[in-house]
């Protein structure tokens, strides 16, 4: 806390300018009017105030707006935003995408801080859903943003927003998240033709069910092994050797290198060795000839 002292004669600030950087903390407290500061916040960023001086400026704004800053002030906080705590930010009502962008810019190139996470949370809750423009902005600043959301939060993403998602935005998503995103992507891209559709849907396929993989296998998509390895194991297991061969096209040769890893390993165990041999890749571990395969899951469903 800065002691309350009278402003020395001739030092009362008429505007926020460079002369203030030579003021001591107590002079800033005494000589800068909080309302003047609020109306000229845009100037603060251009003035190289010290860390301690910024404490005083924040204190003045906190006193002026105990219930939370108005958006007109928030939009021009600039690097003073880095002084805010999550508790401060929870008092704000940020509705403008321009305000959000201005504050994210200050944190650009750094991982998401608790302040930024709180800001985004307030903004998205205020909007009611993650619309395309917001998602565009957030993934531009934080490529991993989408994968930081819970499946419940992702359910509020409208299919139209999926167009803003780039493959790298999904790199850290787990299967539960892709389970939510895949149906939205399928809906968003449904009017595209085969090859274009596959390019767009490819990053989301970790959430695809068996029937969709079977359908893709009929479209000469030539899925690469990296994508195949990210598919849900339970979706891959029912695929036949012929379907996997069609799905992967020329990439089918890559199965050999992945035969010890999921989902390839588990898929091999479900195939007849005879069928695997038709691939000519030397894949081993299939069901030997003459063995009967009982689908116990089907038996349980019937009883």
């Amino acid at each position: 806390e800065v002691e309350k002292t009278a402003c020395p004669s001739g030092k009362k600030a008429r505007e926020i300018d460079e002369s203030l950087i030579f003021y001591k903390k107590w002079e800033l407290e005494a000589c800068v009017d909080a309302a003047l500061l609020a109306t000229q916040m845009d100037r603060v960023n251009a003035i190289p105030f010290t860390y301690e001086q910024l404490d005083v400026l924040k204190h003045k704004l906190d006193e002026l707006y105990p219930q939370g800053y108005p958006e007109s002030v928030i939009q021009h906080l600039g690097y003073l935003f880095l002084k805010m705590s999550p508790e401060d930010i929870r008092k704000w009502n940020v509705t403008s995408l321009e305000t959000l962008k201005a504050l994210l810019e200050v944190n650009k190139g750094h991982e998401m801080s608790p302040q930024v996470a709180t800001l985004i949370d307030r903004f998205v809750k205020g909007r009611g859903q993650l619309d395309k423009d917001t998602l565009d902005t957030l993934t531009a600043f934080y490529p991993g943003y989408l994968c930081s959301l819970s499946p419940e939060e992702l359910s509020s993403v409208p299919p139209s927003s999926i167009w803003a998602v780039r493959p790298q935005d999904l790199d850290t998503c787990d299967p539960r998240q892709l389970d939510v995103l895949y149906p939205k992507a399928r809906l968003a891209f449904q009017n595209m033709n085969g090859s274009e559709y596959f390019v767009k849907i490819q990053s989301f396929l970790g959430g695809a069910p068996t029937e969709d993989l079977k359908a893709l296998s009929q479209q000469n998509v030539s899925m690469d092994l990296a994508t195949f390895m990210k598919l849900r194991t339970d979706a891959v297991l029912p695929l036949t050797v012929a379907e996997v061969q069609k799905l992967l096209g020329p990439h089918v040769e890559g199965l050999k290198a992945e035969e010890r890893h999921r989902p390839v390993r588990d898929w091999i165990l479900r195939q007849r060795q005879d069928d695997l041999d038709t691939l000519g890749l030397g894949l081993q571990g299939g069901i030997p000839n003459g063995y009967l395969v009982l689908d116990l899951s089907m038996q349980e469903a019937l009883s």
Epitope: T50, Y51, Y79, K83, V106, K108, G109
Partner: nanobody, 118 residues
Framework: QVQLVESGGGLVQAGGSLRLSCAAS????????YGWYRQAPGKQRDLVAI???????NYADSVKGRFAISKDNVNNTVYLQMNSLTSEDTGVYYC????????????WGQGTQVTVSS
């Protein structure tokens, strides 16, 4: 690890000149501003001169027209040219830099002593 190392201080006669240097190392972020502070014996540390990333300079009233701050962006070095020195200029001079992107942080050097004898 950011390090600021000052040099160029010493004993000088009133009316004389000195040039302080501050070599900055370990900087992996855009610097918002560099500055020089002076701490006279028994007093608080006061800002003397500051230069922003764009090259804008500002000076305390007591040194205007006598001191000049400059920076060499290639070598990450900041200078303070001090002319017409008086006994009032005696003190420890600290180099300082501001980080304002990603985090708010001020970095300081260890200081260099300047003594002006009359």
């Amino acid at each position: 690890q950011v390090q600021l190392v000052e040099s160029g201080g010493g004993l000088v006669q009133a009316g004389g000149s000195l040039r302080l240097s501050c070599a900055a190392s370990g900087i992996t972020f855009p610097v918002n501003a560099y500055g020089w502070y002076r701490q006279a014996p028994g007093k608080q540390r006061d800002l003397v001169a500051i230069i922003s990333a764009g090259g804008t300079t500002n000076y305390a009233d007591s040194v205007k027209g006598r001191f000049a701050i400059s920076k060499d962006n290639v070598n990450n070095t900041v200078y303070l040219q001090m002319n017409s020195l008086t006994s009032e200029d005696t003190g420890v001079y600290y180099c300082y830099l501001q980080r304002r992107i990603g985090m708010l942080r001020d970095y300081w050097g260890q200081g260099t002593q300047v003594t002006v004898s009359s």
